[in-house]
């Protein structure tokens, strides 16, 4: 949220547009005549990245001048100068910060405590006085009866033989964010939330260790929902529907095993968890939650740099890194794509200015913080330039926690960033075996959607940006994210290759930036969500007798995902037969591209209500995820199903995907208007 | 509809053995902690063996501790009970009875078989 | 061991009177883990109140639980002619074995 000062000293993001070649990088004596090629480009980053030591600067930046850096504190700031200062260094086109006024959760001074009572209320003993907590929780104390929910999913809670209106409920750390857990328990009237790191998921040999993350359903200053709390458009005070109403508090593992031993009945063995894991709290002891923490204002400071396009100025791909952490651990959570943001600027910088390279579009380096609080600075940014930001930021890289193992090369991404990753992953080799990273002609099913804690959510889910964020990862979680063991020490003991992990996500990255500022064609698939539209639609045909039932068809929607099939052809043979050297015709025909992500955000949702608009990947009643598991519901179970609602679904769904397809035909004549 | 049947009751000689079961039907058995009860005739009941829903903890009267074993297979809905080295003394009619609540298994007995009767006799 | 003694042995009342039927406990049981049964002959005991003083589904509201520590009554406000038969205090909040009364029998005077 941002308080807007004298207009003079504010830097908009509009003068990153500006095209004044005088503002561009200094270059020295390069050949400017002949255009690089993609094969140079590619040979001369590698290049690059190999003279690099990505592991002196994680190191550098998780050792004590820069931790601890929560969001807003001394130390976060520091950090936040010493990058703007290096990306002055780089001498880029323009440097510029954004600074904000936003509410963060911290811990009172009166000690957030667990304890077990009896029947009567009376203390049994304190379990423990957590050293950790969670933001945005409700500061409440509560009372009640402690029930197992494994990792606390929608599943979980339907498996339990146990209602849990009225109880504490107890999760496992993983799986799914601290936020849905707590969201799917309040959804079922429990009244507090403990989440604890099982040793079977997060081997640690310190049971005591405490740690940290936040419980906002969202992203954002939660206290500012949907829109930037700039001083002169006097919102009233508005909170967030993703925050929790009842309180919730991670706890070490030797403190849930000390209320386990006040518990009974067994896990079940296909929890795959500790030994020591039990269910429901004797039923002569209640568990006694009380947390008290506190919303302080704090200005947190997000960091901008822009190296401008020499054709299309006014478009860019936004690089972006989260730059503070939560607790004194850093190097997982935030040094490794700080420490990469850095170093792709470097390597970037030094390409424009020795080698030639001319990128046609922009690329805006951004340092962000409050990520630990939601990618609340990620956010901020994006509310507060939400219009000035469609058309022409394109897609945004994310950076965070891009090594956590070696193992596996994961992806999440906008289906439009598929077919580029996909060749990006043919061309880089796994620094370990060798190998492609390409292991599996069949990846894009193994494509995880974005989750709320990912910086990447709320560009593509909020902004309608394609969107990628990326890690090298083992199949189980890295076990100190959020926690003060989250050292560099630990990091190269789990990752002993680390410099060459980060170098590999650095080839990644910078090959994605090269391929989307470089190529006169935007590097989006388009028609990569004719397969997620024509998936939808399937899914919605088991349910043909359902929907007939309810005198309703599916016709408009087949004519919907048609049109949308019909104008991705288009679109195809459009490039197909234009001159690759008209730059006017290939801008028109990528910003045709560039409409489809942002025409996926519902028009009939507000963004202050519903933030993540999209269809696909938002959260809310217009998504088609929800339009599915409401009709589910009328098999299943007639009352809970809510025709009514279903009916505006499918109508708004069906008008928003011909409303995208629309938008791709392009101009308003060439719309096959027979809907 | 809620229910508990008892099978495997009979005549057997002091010092052998016989294995009971229980099969369980109408609830999410897994759920549910199971115990054994037994009643000599004309006498009261006895609490004889319990055992957790997942089948993690069990528990005896000394009465039939070291002899008796009791185990449960969920994905048959089942409770069995193992009676080794009978004695004269282990005649009665022997119930299996359901917890109240999920999970616990220091809980009421709502839910009982209507019984299977053993007598150890020469 | 835990050992519960009710009493009396045997009641004998006629239907529409009040029983009031006492388990004692040898050392303190916690309210929340007492319960009593039903046993009429030849059927399967039956669930009547647990946690000292809860109904169990399905129980007329003529029959209360009561009491804490080492004495807990069951009362049974008017009897009626289906009520009477054995009733079984027990005891399942100690460490094992969890033990009944010997029960009181309840009969028509």
């Known amino acids: 949220c941002k308080r807007v000062e004298q207009k003079e000293e504010c830097v908009k993001l509009a003068e990153t547009e500006e095209t004044d070649k005088s503002e561009t990088m200094e270059t020295e004596d390069v050949p400017t005549s002949s255009r690089l090629y993609w094969a140079d480009l590619k040979t001369l980053l590698s290049e690059k990245l190999n003279s690099i030591e990505f592991a002196d600067t994680i190191k550098q930046l998780s050792q004590n001048t820069y931790t601890p850096r929560e969001a807003g504190s001394q130390k976060d700031e520091s950090l936040a100068y010493y990058i703007e200062n290096q990306f002055h260094e780089f001498k880029f086109s323009k440097v510029w910060r954004d600074e904000h006024y936003v509410k963060i959760q911290v811990k009172d001074s009166a000690q957030n405590s667990v304890i077990i009572v009896d029947k009567n209320g009376r203390l049994v003993y304190l379990v423990e006085n957590p050293g950790g907590y969670v933001a945005y929780s409700k500061a409440a104390t509560v009372t009640g009866k402690l029930v197992h929910a494994n990792f606390g999913t929608k599943k979980d809670f339907e498996d339990l033989y146990t209602p849990v209106n009225g109880s504490i409920v107890i999760v496992r750390a993983g799986k799914i964010t601290f936020a849905e857990k707590v969201a799917n328990a309040e959804s079922l009237n429990a009244i507090g939330v403990l989440i604890y790191m099982d040793q079977t998921k997060f081997p640690i040999v310190n049971a005591e260790l405490s740690f940290f993350g936040h419980a906002h359903l969202g992203t954002g200053d939660p206290y500012t929902p949907g829109f930037p709390s700039f001083n002169h458009t006097q919102f009233p005070p508005s909170r967030s529907s993703g925050l929790p109403n009842i309180p919730v508090q991670t706890i070490s593992r030797a403190a849930a095993e000390k209320l386990f031993g006040n518990m009974e009945g067994d896990c079940p063995s296909d929890w795959k968890t500790d030994s020591t894991c039990r269910m429901v709290t004797s039923e002569s002891k209640n568990v006694k939650l009380t947390v008290s923490n506190v919303l302080k204002e704090r200005r947190i400071l997000n960091i901008f740099g822009v190296i401008k396009g020499y054709e299309e100025p006014d478009r860019y791909v936004v690089v972006g890194a989260q730059r503070d952490a939560l607790g004194a651990g850093v190097a997982a959570k935030s040094s490794v794509g700080t420490g990469l943001l850095l170093k792709l600027a470097q390597v970037f910088s030094d390409m424009i200015s020795k080698d030639g390279f001319r990128p046609s579009r922009s690329i805006i380096f951004a340092s962000w913080t409050a990520g630990d609080f939601g990618a609340v600075g990620a956010t901020e940014w994006l509310e507060g330039y939400l219009s000035s930001l469609h058309l022409k930021a394109f897609t945004y890289i994310n950076l965070d926690k891009v090594v956590l193992g070696t193992s596996n090369f994961k992806v999440s991404a906008s289906p439009l960033l598929y077919t580029l990753m996909g060749k990006i992953m043919q061309d880089v080799k796994h620094p370990v075996d060798g190998k492609s990273l390409y292991r599996d002609s069949n990846w894009i099913s193994k494509v995880e959607k974005l989750s709320f804690d990912n910086a990447a959510y709320p560009f593509l889910a909020y902004s309608g940006i394609p969107a990628v964020s990326f890690c090298f990862c083992e199949d189980a979680d890295y076990p100190y994210l959020g926690t003060r063991l989250d050292t560099y020490e630990a990091l190269t003991q789990k990752v002993p290759q680390l410099n060459q992990m980060v170098r590999t996500a650095a080839e990644v990255a910078g090959q994605l930036i090269i391929k989307l500022t470089h190529d006169v064609e935007l590097n989006l698939d388009y028609e990569r969500y004719n397969s997620q539209l024509l998936s939808f639609v399937r899914d919605l045909n088991q349910y043909r007798a359902d929907i007939k039932e309810m005198g309703l068809s599916l016709q408009w929607l087949y004519s919907a995902r048609g049109d949308f099939f019909r104008a991705t052809s288009r679109l195809t043979t459009d490039f197909g037969n234009a001159e690759k050297t008209d730059r006017f015709v290939m801008k028109k025909l990528n910003d045709r591209v560039m409409r489809v992500e942002y025409h996926f955000l519902s028009p009939y949702v507000s963004p202050k209500e519903s933030p993540f608009r999209h269809v696909f990947w938002g959260s809310g009643s217009h998504t088609l995820p929800a339009l599915l598991e409401n009709l589910k519901l009328r098999k299943q179970n007639n009352g809970a199903f809510n025709e009514t609602l279903f009916r505006n679904q499918l109508a708004l769904a069906t008008w928003t995907i011909q409303g995208a397809a629309n938008a791709l035909s392009g101009d308003v004549w060439d719309i096959d208007n027979e809907f | 509809e809620v229910q508990l049947v008892e099978s495997g009751g009979g005549l057997v000689q002091p010092g052998g053995s016989l294995s009971l079961s229980c099969a369980a039907s109408?609830?999410?058995?897994?759920?549910?902690?199971m115990s054994w009860v037994r009643q000599a005739p004309g006498k009261g009941l006895e609490w004889v063996s319990s055992?957790?829903?997942?089948?993690?903890?069990?528990y005896y009267a000394d009465s039939v501790k070291g002899r008796f074993t009791i185990s449960r297979d969920n994905s048959k809905n089942t409770l069995y009970l193992q009676m080794n080295s009978l004695r004269a003394e282990d005649t009665a009619v022997y119930y299996c009875?359901?917890?109240?609540?999920?999970?616990?298994?220091?809980?009421?007995?709502?839910?009982w078989g209507q019984g299977t009767t053993v007598t150890v006799s020469s | 061991e835990i050992v519960l003694t009710q009493s009396p042995g045997t009641l004998s009342l006629s239907p529409g009177e009040r029983a009031t039927l006492s388990c004692r406990a040898s050392?303190?049981?916690?309210?929340?883990?007492l319960a009593w049964y039903q046993q009429k002959p030849g059927q399967a005991p039956r669930l009547l109140i647990y946690?000292?003083?809860s109904r169990a589904t399905g129980i007329p509201d003529r029959f209360s639980g009561s009491g804490s520590g080492t004495d807990f009554t069951l009362t049974i406000s008017r009897l009626e002619p289906e009520d009477f038969a054995v009733y079984y205090c027990?005891?399942?909040?100690?460490?094992?074995?969890?033990?009944f009364g010997q029960g009181t029998k309840v009969e028509i005077k």
């Open positions: 009875a359901k917890t109240l609540g999920a999970y616990y298994i220091k809980s009421a007995m709502d839910v």
């Open positions: 109408g609830f999410s058995f897994k759920g549910y902690s």
């Open positions: 055992l957790s829903n997942g089948g993690g903890s069990s």
């Open positions: 050392q303190s049981v916690s309210s929340s883990y």
């Open positions: 946690g000292a003083s």
């Open positions: 027990q005891q399942y909040g100690s460490s094992p074995p969890w033990t």
